[in-house]
Amino acid sequence: LVVTPPGPELVLNVSSTFVLTCSGSAPVVWERMSQEPPQEMAKAQDGTFSSVLTLTNLTGLDTGEYFCTHNDSRGLETDERKRLYIFVPDPTVGFLPNDAEELFIFLTEITEITIPCRVTDPQLVVTLHEKKGDVALPVPYDHQRGFSGIFEDRSYICKTTIGDREVDSDAYYVYRLQVSSINVSVNAVQTVVRQGENITLMCIVIGNEVVNFEWTYPRKESGRLVEPVTDFLLDMPYHIRSILHIPSAELEDSGTYTCNVTESVNDHQDEKAINITVVESGYVRLLGEVGTLQFAELHRSRTLQVVFEAYPPPTVLWFKDNRTLGDSSAGEIALSTRNVSETRYVSELTLVRVKVAEAGHYTMRAFHEDAEVQLSFQLQINVPVRVLELSESHPDSGEQTVRCRGRGMPQPNIIWSACRDLKRCPRELPPTLLGNSSEEESQLETNVTYWEEEQEFEVVSTLRLQHVDRPLSVRCTLRNAVGQDTQEVIVVPHSLPFK
């Protein structure tokens, strides 16, 4: 097989057109991603076969492997195959897309694997990171394949810099199945304890009659041995349990507790580990942030959520304007605190069909005998705007005035507009905005008042029209963050006797 150009690696320009030719003594074909792209096949007079693949309007997504192979039923040797790798540097393409299959790497043994993050430009510097860390891992990179090495059972991402922006790849997950005929599980009554409390761990083996347990734990390393107790769980066949009990834990008992189980008949073994943390005293810690100003919309329901970690389990109270809240019998307020993991809690305050009176200063307090934390925020009730009044008058001065009054929270904006051609506006022609400083024929005066009791703003705006020479449709639109409302009135010139 003869390939032109020969490669084995080409770097082509984005948006360009490029021709690849392959020829051989039998029919030949170009393959890309296990498929045959459109190509021109021919047979010359001297019996040589060829295939021409024309790549047009190249993009970064054309980066990858191209193969030329014999397309023949005579079964020529399978190694008669030429590989070409094309790069099309394209700043709009970060990492080449992966199939879902490539994002999950499954192993049963320790073996070299490739994390297939590939870029379009062979000049780019690519680094590999654990998903949770910033430090680049010392793993060799091949621009055509990705990072190859022996990887732990973790998640990884690749990073590169294109121009001045840092680009991350999708996350790759390495799953290693520890093949074992022994099924061991380890659990603890609690994985967090205070000093002086007890640590109790259980290691359970399923499906084996004769096993040997060996525990490794922080105390053992200092020569202070604890005798585990082994028993059979009679309600289940071949469930054997080893219990490790450490009374009155000390800070030094924090660490990894490993249960190693061996079965001598087939020489199988398995081990599982669990981390135990001994804390000096209990704690309560807020997780994440809740802004000091929260919003709810009138008559809608709103749930306010606080996430925190605590040990031992805390008491949680909610306050509004320093008064304790409880679940209301009318179902207007619901409080719930749920344990989402051993030491993590989510506390929620749900206001059902929010009322204006529920605006105010809210505090959640979580506490136990060792620690407490509190979080406060102001709740603002947003009220959709409504136009309450739109009236027109024409005082003796000769000018005509239109007054618009409306309310809402947060403060509404007011927009005045007019249609001079009543037949065509607003369907065919857009309304004209009024009240701009450049417009001499109209003047605007707007006053805003905050009503403390109703906790909303009132806007009163007066539009003065200097001379109206034909009927005019004047529209007042009020807008705020949660809605808008519009009313319109027809203003008729003084000279017309009717309204």
Epitope: K131, K132, R154
Partner: nanobody
Framework: QVQLLESGAEVKNPGASVKVSCKAS????????IQWVRQAPGQGLEWMGW????????HSAQKFQGRVTMTRDTSISTAYMELSGLTSDDTAVYYC?????????WGQGTLVTVSS
């Protein structure tokens, strides 16, 4: 302690369907994708597909499309994988697995035997 507990072994006739369950505990069920993987006798691991327990979205490997259905019941933190049109080539240990970012967790495996 994250744990995945799978249902027991099954023997099926060719052409039948099998439904394997995977009960998760020790973590918020909706937090991590559930993967389904199988291992036929003497073969390596073969990825079948994933399930997003939060949304119920799934994605299966091309080989299994149209034959595999992945579902979940969040109220009992359980994922299910149903494989239809069984043949003897589907005899394998079926695993569910999940990844917490810093390590993977596996079910104990469910042996499915297809024979007439």
């Amino acid at each position: 302690q994250v744990q995945l507990l799978e249902s027991g072994a099954e023997v099926k006739n060719p052409g039948a369907s099998v439904k394997v369950s995977c009960k998760a505990s020790g973590y918020p069920f909706s937090a991590y994708y559930i993967q389904w993987v199988r291992q036929a006798p003497g073969q390596g691991l073969e990825w079948m597909g994933w399930l997003n327990p939060n949304s119920g979205d799934t994605h299966s490997a091309q080989k299994f499309q149209g034959r595999v259905t992945m579902t979940r019941d969040t109220s009992i933190s359980t994922a299910y994988m149903e494989l239809s049109g069984l043949t003897s080539d589907d005899t394998a240990v079926y695993y569910c697995a999940t990844h917490g970012g810093d390590r993977s967790y596996w079910g104990q495996g469910t042996l499915v035997t297809v024979s007439s």
